[in-house]
C-alpha cells in the first residue's frame, strides 16, 4: 500500500519550445489526473559543456519510479536530455544531477521569478 506520499497538486511549469507549441513559456501548472492515480512534477534539461538549458517542467502522470521521491534528482550518466521527477507541490523548482558513477552532485537553482498560474 502507498503510505504517506506527498500529494502533488501544482508544479512549476516551463516550456523552452513555447512559441512553436503555442503554450505559455513559464508559470505554475495545476495537475489533473484520474481518480486514485498519483501525480508528480518533473524537470528536463540539457547540459552543453556545463551550460544548463531547461527543456520542460510541469506535471507528470502516475509513474511508479517517481513514487516517494521528495527531490528531483536525475541519475543517468550522460543522456541527451536529463530527466527527474518528484512528489510534492513545486518539488521540481530545483533539480539535481547525481550520476550513477558517483561523480559530483550538481544542483540547479532557478532564478527568482514571479510566475503566472496556468490552468
Amino acid at each position: 500500500s502507498g503510505r504517506g506520499e506527498a500529494e502533488t497538486r501544482e508544479c512549476i511549469y516551463y516550456n523552452a519550445n513555447w512559441e512553436l507549441e503555442r503554450t505559455n513559456q513559464s508559470g505554475l501548472e495545476r495537475c489533473e489526473g484520474e481518480q486514485d492515480k498519483r501525480l508528480h512534477c518533473y524537470a528536463s534539461w540539457r547540459n552543453s559543456s556545463g551550460t544548463i538549458e531547461l527543456v520542460k517542467k510541469g506535471c507528470w502522470l502516475d509513474d511508479f519510479n517517481c513514487y516517494d521521491r521528495q527531490e528531483c534528482v536525475a541519475t543517468e550518466e550522460n543522456p541527451q536530455v536529463y530527466f527527474c521527477c518528484c512528489e510534492g507541490n513545486f518539488c521540481n523548482e530545483r533539480f539535481t544531477h547525481l550520476p550513477e558513477a558517483g561523480g559530483p552532485e550538481v544542483t540547479y537553482e532557478p532564478p527568482p521569478t514571479a510566475p503566472t498560474l496556468l490552468t
Partner: antibody
C-alpha cells in the same frame, strides 16, 4: 553493467515460508523502484509486487496480499520477498526487475525457482 | 479485476510482417498506461523490447516497433526472422503501483 542476482529459491512444503533476495549492482539501487515478477511452469509472466525507491510504498497482486512482503535494504543494494503460507500455486520462477521511468521493467534477473510441494 | 488480453498464438513467414495486440477489459489502452513489450525465449529471462508505447529499448533492432492501434497497444515486427520465434508479453501500468501482464503471444516463424 547492470546485474540482478536472485537467490533463496528451493523446495518448500505447503504452508511453509521462504525469503528471496535480489542482489543489485551496476546502478544506483537506492534511486530505482523495484519489482518481483513470477512465471509458473509452462505459464505466462505475472507481476507479483513492487516497492518504491524509499520502500515507503509497496504493492501486491491480489493472490499474494497478506502472505508476501516486499522490502529493500538500500545500504546493501538488496531487494527481498518474504513469502509465507506458501501454496502449490506459488510454484514458479521468481524474477526481480528494475523499474524505470514510464513504469517499465528495464532490467531483469535470471530468476530463482520456488517449488511448493509436499 | 483488470484482464489484459493478447492473441494466444500467431504465425508469420520469414521476412513477413506481424502485428501483435494488447487490450484490456475495462476500456481503451492509451499512452497513459505506458504500454511496454517483452520477448522471452524458453528457459531465459524476459528481454525488454518497447516501453512508453513506442520507444525501443537499447539494442533492440528497428524491425520492432510499438504503437496504439484503435483501442489497443500494438507490437509490429517487420521482416520477421527465425530468431524472433518467442513468447511476447505486453504490460500495462494501471497506476497506483499496479502492473498487469497480458497472457502472452507465442509467435511462430515458418
Amino acid at each position: 553493467e547492470v546485474q540482478l542476482l536472485e537467490s533463496g529459491g528451493g523446495l518448500v512444503q505447503p504452508g511453509g515460508s521462504l525469503r528471496l533476495s535480489c542482489a543489485a549492482s551496476g546502478f544506483t539501487f537506492r534511486n530505482s523502484a523495484m519489482s518481483w515478477v513470477r512465471q509458473a511452469p509452462g505459464k505466462g509472466l505475472e507481476w507479483v509486487s513492487s516497492i518504491s525507491v524509499t520502500g515507503g510504498s509497496t504493492y501486491y497482486t491480489d493472490s499474494v496480499k497478506g502472505r508476501f512482503t516486499v522490502s529493500r535494504d538500500n545500504s546493501r543494494n538488496t531487494l527481498y520477498l518474504q513469502m509465507n503460507s506458501l501454496r502449490a500455486e506459488d510454484t514458479a520462477v521468481y524474477y526481480c526487475a528494475k523499474v524505470y521511468y514510464y513504469s517499465f521493467f528495464d532490467y531483469w534477473g535470471q530468476g530463482t525457482l520456488v517449488t511448493v510441494s509436499s | 479485476q483488470t484482464v489484459v488480453t493478447q492473441e494466444p498464438s500467431f504465425s508469420v513467414s520469414p521476412g513477413g510482417t506481424v502485428t501483435l495486440t494488447c487490450g484490456f477489459n475495462s476500456g481503451s489502452v492509451s499512452t497513459s498506461y505506458y504500454p511496454s513489450w517483452y520477448q522471452q525465449t524458453p528457459g531465459q529471462a524476459p528481454r525488454t523490447l518497447i516501453y512508453n508505447t513506442n520507444t525501443r529499448s537499447s539494442g533492440v533492432p528497428d524491425r520492432f516497433s510499438g504503437s496504439i492501434l484503435g483501442n489497443k497497444a500494438a507490437l509490429t515486427i517487420t521482416g520477421a526472422q527465425a530468431d524472433d520465434e518467442s513468447d511476447y508479453y505486453c504490460v500495462l501500468y494501471m497506476g497506483s503501483g499496479i502492473h498487469v501482464f497480458g497472457g502472452g503471444t507465442k509467435l511462430t516463424v515458418l
